[in-house]
């Protein structure tokens, strides 16, 4: 017996689609070997129609695909726009067609529904509207019009022209009699339920001269669209339910076992905690269509999703719906990156954002997720030189290190900066990732003066004190502008005296501005980096004023310590919990730390179940000075 398994028989109708799942033992050889779907010929042999190696027969061009799910030991063949010519015997299998690793599938495609012995067939999707048309003769124009449903052997009255409505149809059915010119009445049923399916009889008049018309109503559950996305990536569900529900509350729910469909998000403001920080419900168009974006996909996000419309904002009988089956590919092209970055108040964070390396020329963006209404993510910075006004001087998006990663540095952190941020580009929408910034207790590592005033035409020296832990890192000063931070020459002034219990490896590095001009006014950052990987930064605002007395200015840290508006910040070094994926070159001396506060926080963003990957400074490494 072959170990391959699948449906023995598949029956469908013309124009429909089928999804044929074939199961195989998920050994490593099987997972990676060729998968195929072939049609058996009359004389034996099996002609390949589609395979996992990219081959698609001309018969299937544009209407079929084959997707392998190695982690499940399955592959799925989707075939759309079926015709009766597709009826036949097929095999789904592994390896070479002529070998025995296959399963026989019979596909039978019958003619689509039409007029059968004077019965009009109505095929309508669940939750939608049907109009059953009922013709009659002139002699019955003034007589009672009615619609019956055949239940078992007996017709049951559904609605009539005298005002009766069957309780099962209350609030969702009406009987319309056309103008005198047309000998037709129609029954409109909204919010169709599965239980509405069946045989109906229209009748005009009640005697032997009555006019009768049979109708067969078929209510279809929506065929789920298969969506296959990468772990840590993004998915967008586009939901078009039609203009008739444009003003009805919309929802996206995820089906759990049994009868429940748990709301993920709806337009009434409900959002599942597991999706906090990583979901947006985009505003609907006039036609009632809307979309839902979920980023930072996790293994447990896989499943069946329904979008729909109902005044309760959740799935109810008769909700018009659309369905998707989301698979999350664990063999992801999107690199593992920290989902939580920790920063000390007054300090900084450096966030690494992945993007599709094939799109190095794309515009990079960073936005702040807001939970209000249906979720939104207003942009804070982009790679084209735009920075939101409130973030000037403390936010920079750098193209470095490049090759699939860009860096965002945010300094002068306050508790208001805690939240969820999204990395995205104007290219591949699947590469949207989410990071949560948490603000923790501690002291910034870098010491800079608070605010500095330079005098026109004079020389200004601004100190930055680096603790010994940064002895092996490159230290720099730069001038912030909205396109980045332009490097400036700086001088190493030897060991710093700003740190207690810190040896000769601490450093004081100064920025010198000679012959200060108005153009020198602005934000300056000192920081550490190694190669193209950025660590902690500290920011100083330099104001420029008219000369009062001659001489040069040398700003000391002591003055800055007394300053009420001192700007300070946290380390951008990355600490990854449980799975240490630190860059060994940059953060060799930092250890992976388990922070129990985050382990216990159920609403925390986490890309990968079972791991909490975090980036940020631990207060254990901060040195205090007085």
């Amino acid at each position: 017996k072959s170990p391959i398994f699948g449906p023995e028989e598949v029956n469908s109708v013309e124009g429909n689609s089928v999804s044929i799942t074939c199961y195989y033992p998920p050994t490593s050889v099987n997972r990676h070997t060729r998968k195929y779907w072939c049609r058996q010929g009359a004389r034996g042999g099996c002609i390949t129609l589609i395979s996992s190696e990219g081959y698609v027969s001309s018969k299937y061009a544009g209407r079929a695909n084959l997707t392998n799910f190695p982690e499940n030991g399955t592959f799925v063949v989707n075939i759309a726009q079926l015709s009766q010519d597709d009826s036949g015997r097929y095999k789904c299998g592994l390896g070479i067609n002529s070998r025995g690793l296959s399963f026989d599938v019979s596909l039978e495609v019958s003619q689509g529904p039409g007029l059968l012995n004077d019965t009009k067939v109505y095929t309508v999707d669940l939750g939608r509207t049907v109009t059953i048309n009922c013709p009659f003769k002139t002699e019955n124009a003034q007589k009672r019009k009615s619609l019956y449903k055949q239940i078992g052997l007996y017709p049951v009255l559904v609605i009539d022209s005298s005002g009766y409505v069957n309780p099962n149809y209350t609030g969702r059915i009406r009987l319309d009699i056309q103008g005198t010119g047309q000998l037709l009445f129609s029954v409109v049923i909204n919010q169709l339920r599965l239980s509405d399916a069946g045989q109906y009889l229209c009748q005009a008049g009640d005697d032997s001269n009555s006019n009768k018309k049979n109708a067969d109503l078929q209510v279809l559950k929506p065929e789920p669209e298969l969506v296959y996305e990468d772990l840590r990536g993004s998915v967008t569900f586009h939901c078009a339910l039609g203009p008739e529900v444009a003003n009805v509350a919309k929802f996206l729910c995820r089906q759990s076992s049994g009868e429940n469909c748990d709301v993920v998000v709806n337009t009434l403001g409900k959002r599942a905690p597991a999706f906090e920080g990583r979901i947006l419900l985009n505003p609907q168009d006039k036609d009632g269509s809307f979309s839902v974006v979920i980023t930072g996909l996790r293994k447990e996000d896989a499943g069946r999703y329904l979008c729909g419309a109902h005044s309760d904002g959740q799935l109810q009988e008769g909700s018009p719906i659309q369905a998707w089956q989301l698979f999350v590919n664990e063999e992801s092209t999107i690199p593992r990156s920290p989902t939580v970055v920790k920063g000390v108040a007054g300090s900084s964070v450096a966030v690494l954002c992945p993007y599709n390396r094939k799109e190095s020329k794309s515009i990079k963006y960073w936005c702040l997720w807001e939970g209000a209404q249906n979720g939104r993510c207003p942009l804070l910075v982009d790679s084209e030189g735009w920075v939101k006004a409130q973030y000037e001087g403390r936010l920079s998006l750098l193209e470095e290190p490049g090759n699939g990663t860009f860096t965002v540095i945010l300094n002068q952190l306050t508790s208001r900066d805690a939240g969820f941020y999204w990395c995205l580009t104007n290219g591949d929408t699947l590469w949207r990732t989410t990071v949560e910034i948490k603000i923790i207790e501690g002291e910034p590592n870098l010491k800079v003066p608070g605010n500095v005033t330079a005098v026109l035409g004079e020389t200004l020296k601004v100190p930055c004190h680096f603790p010994c832990k940064f002895s092996s890192y490159e230290k720099y000063w730069c001038k912030w502008n909205n396109t980045g931070c332009q490097a400036l020459p700086s001088q190493d002034e030897g060991p710093s005296k700003a740190f207690v219990n810190c040896d000769e490896n601490s450093r004081l590095v100064s920025l010198t501005l000679n012959l200060v001009t108005r153009a020198d006014e602005g934000w300056y950052w000192c920081g550490v980096k190694q190669g193209h990987f950025y660590g902690e930064t500290a920011a100083v605002y330099v104001a420029v004023e008219e000369r009062k007395a001659a001489g040069s200015r040398d700003v000391s840290l002591a003055k800055a310590d007394a300053a009420p508006d001192e700007k300070v910040l946290d380390s951008g070094f990355r600490e990854i919990e449980n799975k240490a994926i630190q860059d060994p070159r940059l953060f060799a001396e930092e250890k992976a730390v388990a922070d129990t506060r985050d382990q216990a926080d159920g609403s925390r963003a986490s890309v990968d179940s079972g791991s909490s990957e975090e980036q940020g400074g631990s207060s254990r490494h901060h040195h205090h000075h007085h």
């Epitope: 398994f5 449906p7 023995e8 028989e9 598949v10 029956n11 469908s12 109708v13 429909n16 689609s17 089928v18 999804s19 044929i20 799942t21 199961y23 799910f69 499940n72 399955t74 799925v76 529904p113 095929t123 339920r193 599965l194 239980s195 078929q218 279809l220 559950k221 929506p222 065929e223 789920p224 298969l226 089906q255 759990s256 076992s257 049994g258 009868e259 429940n260 896989a302 499943g303 069946r304 009988e317 369905a323 089956q325 698979f327």
Partner: nanobody, 130 residues
Framework: EVQLVESGGGLVQTGGSLRLSCAAS????????MGWFRQAPGKEREFVAA??????????YVGGSVQGRFTISRDAAGNTVYLQMNSVKPEDTAVYYC?????????????????????WGKGTQVTVSS
């Protein structure tokens, strides 16, 4: 409350035929898939056959040990499923259980796995005498 009620079991001669029925009932219950499993004394529950539907498309699955002998079908309303058992053998003797799914699962879930079915009937005994 969803209920699955099996009927049609009984005693049958080797080589004979039997037709089992399973009716699903419950307020607004509309299954998405129904199937049959069987359990012989001292053995694990074994997959026999299943039928899954989506709109006008149906998918029929049959276990290897009964292939070519048993067929599965359903009524037009989709609330009753039938197992036509032909050419029965003594090793077909078992309690036959009906299973149903209200919610379409991840389609990669194997219908042969009893753990992935939501609802179960109480079973009907089939005995094949030689």
């Amino acid at each position: 409350e969803v209920q699955l009620v099996e009927s049609g079991g009984g005693l049958v001669q080797t080589g004979g035929s039997l037709r089992l029925s399973c009716a699903a009932s419950g307020r607004t219950f509309s299954p998405y898939a129904m199937g049959w499993f069987r359990q012989a004394p001292g053995k694990e529950r074994e997959f026999v056959a299943a039928i899954r539907w989506s709109g006008a498309t149906t998918y029929k699955y049959v276990g290897g040990s009964v292939q070519g002998r048993f067929t599965i079908s359903r009524d037009a309303a989709g609330n009753t499923v039938y197992l036509q058992m032909n050419s029965v053998k003594p090793e077909d003797t078992a309690v036959y259980y009906c299973a149903a799914d209200r919610v379409p699962k991840d389609i990669s879930i194997d219908p042969r796995n009893p753990k992935d079915w939501d609802y179960w009937g109480k079973g009907t005994q089939v005995t094949v005498s030689s």
